[in-house]
Amino acid sequence: MKVLQEPTCVSDYMSISTCEWKMNGPTNCSTELRLLYQLVFLLSEAHTCIPENNGGAGCVCHLLMDDVVSADNYTLDLWAGQQLLWKGSFKPSEHVKPRAPGNLTVHTNVSDTLLLTWSNPYPPDNYLYNHLTYAVNIWSENDPADFRIYNVTYLEPSLRIAASTLKSGISYRARVRAWAQCYNTTWSEWSPSTKWHNSYREPFEQH
């Protein structure tokens, strides 16, 4: 049994880091493998993650981490029984993938304005809470070409757009994702999408 693709890990900078790797053949990850992880710090102890299958030869492990600070560094040991298959390290602050925003809502009752709001996925005491920026994706269910991205570079989790920038009388969907420049993170996953029917009064044209 050998590791084909070494584990790569990302942290949500809150409580979970996710490591993925590939073995050289079909593997029952949960029964055959264990990923041990230990914070490099005085008096810390090793903890065990039981991996799950992620495709035939792929494995994924969700490491519980209490919380994260920038100095944290972890040792990782991948074991198959008594055999050490791989040894590495992981610094969560250098491999951050934020949590996806939630509770995306489209408010259509503001005259001729669409107000999209969502929730910051972090509690206020987390460092990322005040460092997230967002991308909002809006697309038409009827027209694949009608696809647009709005970058939200301010901290408030909301976006206002004129209803008239979208076509009237058709359904749209929106989703949002987050990233943090301070840690040069990857983008989060997209939030679940929300759907609404866009309708607004065309301005009366005088001839």
Epitope: L39, F41, L43, D66, A71
Partner: antibody, heavy 125, light 112 residues
């Protein structure tokens, strides 16, 4: 009530051995690291040794390394300090203290928040 | 090893007056994000040490609020807002960022 009680001190000749014990009660003993601190007569406090909750990690002061062994029996809620090759400069009151919570991935530190009453070790010929 | 230096070593105080003890470390005790591994202990005559302050500024359970800790990095201070007779004893700072844990020399607080 959270409590630590030391025992095992006494008078020993240079080169001799003693084993100190520290019995914990009122808390989940295995979840905490434990530490030994000593105080020579008329002197300040000196750290001696620490051990993680499971006993897998141990640390020693240079002055006792190779002579003292820290260990624990979590089934008995007891911490030990085996002291061999004793020297006159090991004469001190020895305290055990509760250290950080190591059951979590990050050891949570609340100071050395519980101390025993101390046990006196005298090394003299 | 991290060297801890306390001052003053002797501190005569009038009851009701404030008192302040300084502790300096030879290297930063800040692990990250403000986790400063610096504690203050009081040892009264004939007794075991007792924890006053942990992680530089957190008051231990049962410690009167006249005791406060501050500082970060290498400079730390213990303040007693109004000294009482029962506060006499030796005060020690201690770092637990790395082994060996190291203590300051101790400050003897006495009543004038």
């Amino acid at each position: 009530e959270v409590q630590l009680v030391e025992s095992g001190g006494g008078l020993e000749q240079p080169g001799g051995s003693l084993r100190l014990s520290c019995a914990g009660s009122g808390f989940t003993f295995r979840d905490y690291a434990m530490t030994w601190v000593r105080q020579a007569p008329g002197k300040g406090l000196e750290w001696v040794s620490s051990i993680s909750g499971s006993g897998s990690n141990t640390y020693y002061a240079d002055s006792v390394k190779g002579r003292f062994t820290i260990s624990r029996d979590n089934s008995k809620n007891t911490l030990y300090l085996q002291m061999n090759s004793l020297r006159a400069e090991d004469t001190a009151v020895y305290y055990c203290a509760r250290d950080r919570l190591t059951a979590a991935v990050r050891p949570y530190y609340y100071g050395l928040d519980v101390w025993g009453q101390g046990t006196t070790v005298t090394v003299s010929s | 090893d991290i060297v801890m230096t306390q001052s003053p070593l002797s501190l005569p105080v009038t009851p009701g007056e404030p008192a302040s003890i300084s502790c300096r470390s030879s290297q930063s005790l800040d692990y990250s994000s403000g986790y400063n591994y610096l504690d203050w202990y009081l040892q009264k005559s004939g007794q075991s040490p007792q924890l006053l302050i942990y992680l530089a500024s957190n008051r231990a359970s049962g410690v009167p609020d006249r005791f406060s800790g501050s500082g970060s990095g290498t400079d730390f201070t213990l303040k007693i807002s109004r000294v009482e007779a029962e506060d006499v004893g030796f005060y020690y700072c201690m770092q637990s960022l790395q082994t060996p844990y190291t203590f300051g020399q101790g400050t003897k607080l006495e009543i004038k």
